[in-house]
Interface confidence: low
């Protein structure tokens, strides 16, 4: 656990009169609908907030939308409906706000059924001025912006076409037809799959890929029998369709779709699907189906290839294609993942890695707790978290797990502590060691936010009632103080503060409901004068991550090396303030089998740490050493882990083995397993 | 083998409570929650509530709430049942019935939810004045 | 709450013969679904779980299917034994909730 010097609660003073001073209502004329909210840039204070309200006629829908801009976080708000003309805007295209800092905002608008194209509103101005744009075709997405030029945009009409603007949305060009997926690589690179015959349903496993790198003056096809493709850190992937039957294969090109390898992972039928579940310029954790519909897969992690897969976690619950899986990169600790697995009996039960999905364990029983009735043992259990899967089953979960990058080692997240997640109602849990150590902060759900890289959190219990309490704790959640916002309660919404946790500024979303109308209504308390001095050197600590016995040198290595970083003390009331940047200080460490993976032909006998080859090759192995390209098949048996930076130490090195002799199959023709297919 | 086993007939005045029992044996008492459903003459099933014997929560049908109080005593592996300001309506045969909704089986696998698997033999409690 | 219709209320079957029971939801329950058979006199039992699942002990012939809000019972071929009452359940959301139960009876 990370350093928590006091145990008792030191309550922060005088702080219902600083933050009476620092709350900020506003009221939003019209009435309730439904309401969207976005930040534009970073650290601007800028909030863009659109209310709509539909009125369902006989004949068509009557719908009303609104436009309010803020310029201080939240505090106050100006009507700017009339910027855009007092048009509906189209809420399911929501607001495309441009990359980084461009102050760049699209707003697509509703338009009568006989018009020859949409419309837009473009503002490169923060939302202070807006142009309207009529467009020369209907849009079936949002408009993407180029992550590398946000004055490069793209999107797919309804007929299928796709446009390109290089003048952010001025003017537009339709670079080609028959479209049916569309994705911007870098360097202003768009990838997209395309159609010959019928339609994108029909042609699915029968698709083209294609790329242009200028925008549309030349293409180039880089794949053909393709089902879907995707990108991911430096990867590009893409589910090519086999020739003998209706099973499909992941290809894997890291030079843009120049050149192709196989990846060495199980082939899918078609009621089964790959996800991506999270990738880096390093390394890609693959999901693959199981067949049949058992609502689990796979997990496999990449080689720094993308190519060599080792089985990371079976039995993992992700629901059917585009459904609901619980995997969640935990942002505050490097290589720390959580997700969920169905076990036998089918209960789902949470498992975490410390180490990018090498080994995966369940999480450690928060102290002081009781194991519920879902566990056999009563003294022996874990904890269990809901995410997206218990979100989409209407379990009472408001939030999915949360944490931040600069608020180090912190996890908030609703669990249950039992043999498996349990339907009753949960209570939230907050680690502050990236998921080694676990405490009960709040009891019963809530909503939760963390300010000023984890110098502040805020909680708001979840409830049908109305309500007005906030609670906020400067000590990580050790200690809770609670604030009467308003005396009138709301309905409440949504908690927003500004992504990135820098901030200090909350927003509480709401609305009133009187006998005739409702109203929106939001409360923005500024924390600034809670932490009333900037930190010092004095308020921080030194804490080694991943640190889980420091009687032994190698302690907190992982992935070859460790890192000690500056944290802020939990006895400190003090702001860390917008520019606060966390240090670290990295370590490299000696190499231990446990930095390398096992190369194709290899695997790791259990509880056993060195790679020994395999007697044979069968199933999707085979394939790969059948049809793989004949660099990947000459190996050592080892290859470093991506991302690890260990030196030294252990090098294990073995005589190279050309695999080519191993590529022999019964089932196959002797003239296919000369072929070398790229 | 697995069974629970409830206590036995009640006659009850209007106004008056009831604490009906159910005594579980043949598998580990704090591993599975327990429902209550309740049968009036000649009526179908009307589930009442649910008590997780580890900490005690319950959750109740919104029907019974303010009405009806389930406890546990892990130590004698017993839930009881509680209903107070009993009514002529209330006149039914009451059920405790081994519920693993707590262990929240996954969806995706069809498999959802396992079913009140072992019931009670069923406690008739007559309101009457 | 969710309410759950259950039709028919009566079904009257010969031995041997087929039958189909229903079970509607008011709203989505995935596959959260049991379903129940109750003699005279007796406890309900455990049938069918997860809307397809056979619990323990029970015969073949006895099968669920459906998801979402459309549920059906089959029984394939009608014994003696199988005359009573039989109940859905729903426990996608809280309160749980029976169907007001199909009467099979002897035709």
């Known amino acids: 656990s990370a350093p928590g010097e006091d145990e008792e609660c030191g309550r922060v003073r005088d702080f219902v009169a600083k933050l009476a001073n620092n709350t900020h209502q506003h009221v939003f004329d019209d009435l309730r609908g439904s309401v969207s909210l976005s930040w534009v840039g970073d650290s601007t204070g800028v909030i863009l907030v659109l209310t709509t309200f539909h009125v369902p006629l006989v004949i068509m829908t009557f719908g009303q939308s609104k436009l309010y801009r803020s310029e201080d976080y939240g505090k106050n708000f100006k009507d700017i409906t009339d910027l855009i003309n007092n048009t509906f805007i189209r809420t399911e295209f929501g607001m495309a706000i441009g990359p980084e800092n461009s102050g760049k905002v699209v707003l697509t608008a509703e338009v009568s059924g006989g018009s020859r194209g949409g419309r837009i509103f473009r503002s490169s101005d923060f939302a202070k001025n807006f142009v309207q744009t009529d467009l020369p075709f209907h849009p079936l997405t949002q408009m993407m912006y180029s992550p590398q030029n946000s004055d490069y945009l793209l999107a797919l009409s309804t007929e299928n076409g796709l446009w390109v603007s290089k003048n952010f949305g001025g003017k537009w060009e339709e670079i080609h037809k028959a479209v049916c997926l569309a994705k911007w690589g870098s360097d202003n690179t768009i990838f997209f799959t395309t159609y010959a015959n019928g339609s994108c349903k029909a042609d699915l496993g029968a698709l083209e890929l294609w790329r242009t790198s200028d925008l549309g003056k030349s293409f180039k096809t880089i794949g053909v029998k393709i089902y879907s493709f995707g990108l991911g850190g430096r990867f590009l992937f893409a589910s090519v369709m086999a020739d003998k039957d209706t099973t499909r294969r992941i290809h894997v090109s890291t030079d843009q779709g120049d050149t192709w390898s196989m990846a060495q992972l199980p082939s899918v039928g078609q009621e089964q699907f790959y996800s991506i579940l999270a990738a880096n310029d390093d390394m890609v954790f693959m999901h693959v189906d199981e067949p049949g519909d058992t609502g689990f897969g796979t997990i496999f992690t990449s080689d720094d290839r993308g190519i060599v897969y080792s089985k990371s976690l079976d039995r993992h619950l992700y629901t059917t294609t585009g459904g609901e899986t619980d995997f969640t990169n935990v942002t505050s600790l490097r290589g720390v993942y959580i997700t969920s697995v169905l076990s036998e009996d089918n209960s789902i039960q949470t498992m975490i890695t410390f180490d990018q999905g090498g080994r995966w364990t369940h999480l450690r029983k928060p102290e002081n707790s009781e194991c519920d009735a879902t566990a056999k043992n009563k003294n022996e259990c874990s904890l269990h978290i809901h995410a997206s899967y218990s979100i989409s089953q209407k379990l009472n979960v408001p939030m999915a797990p949360l944490s931040e990058p600069n608020a180090v080692g912190i996890v908030i997240a609703h669990g249950s502590v039992g043999d498996a997640i349990s339907v009753m109602v949960p209570d939230v849990y907050i680690s502050d060691d990236g998921g080694y150590s676990w405490t009960k902060m709040l009891e019963g759900p809530h909503y939760y936010t963390i300010l000023d890289s984890g110098g502040i959190i805020v909680a708001i219990e979840h409830s049908s009632r109305p309500i007005n309490v906030i609670k906020f704790s400067t000590d990580e959640g050790q200690c809770w103080q609670t604030y009467t916002f308003t005396r009138d309660p709301i309905y409440f919404t949504g908690l927003a503060s500004e992504p990135g946790a820098r901030s200090m500024n909350i927003s509480i979303w709401g609305f009133t409901e009187s006998f005739l109308t409702s109203q929106w209504v939001s409360y923005t308390i500024d924390f600034k004068d809670i932490l009333e001095r900037n930190c010092e050197e004095k308020d921080y600590t030194i804490w080694l991550a991943h640190s889980t016995d420091p009687e032994d040198y190698e302690d907190g290595c992982i992935l070859g090396y460790k890192e000690q970083f500056l944290r802020l003390r939990k006895s400190s009331v003090c702001q860390n303030g917008r520019d606060y940047v966390v240090t670290k200080q990295p370590s490299i460490c000696l190499c231990s089998l446990e930095d390398f993976l096992c190369d194709f032909g290899a695997y790791r006998p259990e509880n056993d740490s060195k790679c020994v080859e395999q007697p044979e090759l069968k199933g999707h192995d085979l394939e790969f050493c059948l049809y793989g390209r004949e660099e990947h098949l000459t190996t050592n048996g080892y290859r470093k882990i991506p991302g690890d930076k260990c030196q030294g130490g252990v090098n294990p090195v073995r005589e190279v083995k050309d695999l080519k002799k191993k590529c022999t199959s019964n089932f196959l023709s002797p003239e296919k397993q000369n072929s070398k297919s790229n | 083998q697995v069974q629970l086993v409830q206590s036995g007939a009640e006659v009850k005045k209007p106004g008056a409570s009831v604490k009906v029992s159910c005594k579980a044996s043949?598998?580990?008492?704090?591993?599975?929650?327990m429902s209550w459903v309740r049968q009036a003459p000649g009526q179908g099933l009307e589930w009442m509530g649910i008590i997780n014997p580890v900490g005690g929560s319950t959750s109740y049908a919104q029907k019974f709430q303010g009405r009806v109080t389930m406890t546990r005593d892990t130590s004698t592996s017993t839930v009881y049942m509680e209903l107070s300001s009993l009514r002529s309506e209330d006149t039914a045969v009451y059920y405790c019935?081994?519920?693993?909704?707590?262990?929240?089986?996954?969806?995706?696998?069809?498999?959802?939810?396992?079913?009140?698997?072992?019931w009670g033999q069923g406690t008739t409690v007559t309101v009457s004045s | 709450e969710i309410v759950m219709t259950q039709s028919p209320a009566t079904l009257s079957v010969s031995p041997g013969e087929r039958a189909t029971l229903s079970c509607r939801a008011s709203q989505s329950v995935s596959s959260n679904l049991a379903w129940y058979q109750q003699k005279p006199g007796q406890a309900p039992r455990l049938l069918i779980y997860?809307?397809?699942t056979r619990a323990t002990g029970i015969p073949a012939r006895f099968s669920g299917s459906g998801s979402g809000t459309e549920f059906t019972l089959t029984i394939s071929s009608l014994q003696s034994e199988d005359f009573a009452v039989y109940y859905c359940q729903q426990a996608r959301l809280g309160p749980w909730t029976f169907g007001g139960g199909t009467k099979v009876e002897i035709k």
């Open positions: 997860g809307a397809s």
């Open positions: 019935a081994r519920d693993p909704s707590g262990i929240a089986a996954a969806g995706p696998a069809s498999r959802y939810y396992y079913g009140m698997d072992v």
């Open positions: 043949g598998y580990t008492f704090t591993s599975r929650y």
